[in-house]
Interface confidence: medium
Amino acid sequence: CKAMHVAQPAVVLASSRGIASFVCEYASPGKATEVRVTVLRQADSQVTEVCAATYMMGNELTFLDDSICTGTSSGNQVNLTIQGLRAMDTGLYICKVELMYPPPYYLGIGNGTQIYVIDPEPCPDSDF
C-alpha cells in the first residue's frame, strides 16, 4: 500500500439545518479509474465510519440509500455533504481516500475537518 496526500479544511460550521459540506482533495500519483472515499468520525479517541462510496472517475459518487452523506466528484476533488447533524455530532470528520484501481493501491487519510454543529434555539412563544 502506497501513501497519498489528502487535504481537507480544518474547520467547518454546519448550517442551522444540520448540513455540513467540505471538499476532500487528493494528490493522485497516477490515473485512477476506481476511487473509494470513506468519511470517518473521531470523537473521544473513538473512530467510527460515517459513510463510504466507491465511484468510477467521471461518474457520480453513490452512497447507500440510507446514508447521511451525498457527494460529487470533479477530478481529484470530492465535494462531501453530511446531513442530519445535531450538536452531539460535533467532532473531527476524517476523509479517507483509496485509489482502488488500477494497481498499485494508494491510501490517503486527511487530517480531519472539525465540524461544529449548533442546535437551533427553539422559537420563543409569541403573544401574536
Epitope: T33, E34, M57, E98
Partner: antibody, heavy 124, light 107 residues
C-alpha cells in the same frame, strides 16, 4: 453457471490481424475488470491486457502495446482482443479471465474465472 | 516491471509428502500475490488469493503465506490429482506478472 468462452483463434501469417472474442455468462459482466492472459506452447503464463468495467481504462503488456486493442461490449456480455501486426512470438493459447469486482471494499486482482482458451498460431 | 522468481522449476514427490514452492518478488509487493494450479491442457485455476486466503472450494491441504518479497505455497499432503504446474502472480502493479511455474510430479 459462471462461464467464459473464447473464440476467433486460428492460423494467421506474420503481419496479419485477428480478433478474439470472449462471451461471458452466469454473472454481471459489466461489474468486473476483464483480462487477457496468454501461454506460448510449453511456456508459462503471460498477462496481456486488462479493461475496466466501463471500458474507459485499458492496460497492456509492453510486448503488445500499440499492436493489440482490448475492448468490451457490456450489452453483449463480450470481451474482445483486436490483434494487429502479429508476430511469430504471439503464437499462444489466449485465455480471457475475470478480474476485480467493481466496488469491492478490499483491494485485489485475482483471476477467479477463466475461459478454455483459443489457440492463435502466427506462421508463414 | 516486477519479476517473480519461482523455485524449484520442477519437483518429484510421493503421495502424502509435504510439498513446498517458493516465490520471490523483485520488490516489495505486500501481500498482493495469488497462486494458480494448471493441469495439462486445461486453463489455470485460482487456489490462493492475497498470499494466504484459500479460494472457495479449494481443499485445505493447499496453503499460502508470506509478505513483502518472499512467499511460500504448501501442499501439506500431496495427492495424485495435484499433478500440475503451479504459478504465483503479483498484482501490486501493472504489468501483472507471473512466476515461471513449478511442475509437480509424483514419484
Amino acid at each position: 453457471e459462471v462461464q467464459l468462452v473464447e473464440s476467433g483463434g486460428g492460423l494467421v501469417q506474420p503481419g496479419g490481424s485477428l480478433r478474439l472474442s470472449c462471451a461471458a455468462s452466469g454473472f454481471t459482466f459489466s461489474s468486473y475488470v476483464m483480462h487477457w492472459v496468454r501461454q506460448a506452447p510449453g511456456k508459462g503464463l503471460e498477462w496481456v491486457s486488462a479493461i475496466t468495467w466501463s471500458g474507459r481504462g485499458t492496460y497492456y503488456a509492453d510486448s503488445v502495446k500499440g499492436r493489440f486493442t482490448i475492448s468490451r461490449d457490456n450489452s453483449k456480455n463480450t470481451l474482445y482482443l483486436q490483434m494487429n501486426s502479429l508476430r511469430a512470438e504471439d503464437t499462444a493459447v489466449y485465455y480471457c479471465a475475470r478480474g476485480r469486482l467493481f466496488g469491492l471494499a478490499l483491494y485485489g486482482e485475482a483471476f477467479d474465472v477463466w475461459g478454455q482458451g483459443t489457440l492463435v498460431t502466427v506462421s508463414s | 516491471d516486477i519479476q517473480m522468481t519461482q523455485s524449484p522449476s520442477s519437483l518429484s514427490a510421493s503421495v502424502g509428502d509435504r510439498v513446498t514452492i517458493t516465490c520471490q518478488a523483485s520488490k516489495d509487493i505486500s501481500n498482493y500475490l495469488n497462486w494458480y494450479q494448471q493441469k495439462p491442457g486445461k486453463a489455470p485455476k485460482l487456489l490462493i488469493y492475497d498470499a494466504s486466503n484459500l479460494e472457495t472450494g479449494v481443499p485445505s491441504r493447499f496453503s499460502g503465506s508470506g509478505s513483502g518479497t518472499d512467499f511460500t505455497f504448501i501442499i501439506s499432503s500431496l495427492q495424485p490429482e495435484d499433478i500440475a504446474t503451479y504459478y504465483c502472480q503479483q498484482f501490486n502493479s501493472f504489468p501483472l506478472t507471473f512466476g515461471q511455474g513449478t511442475k509437480v510430479e509424483i514419484k
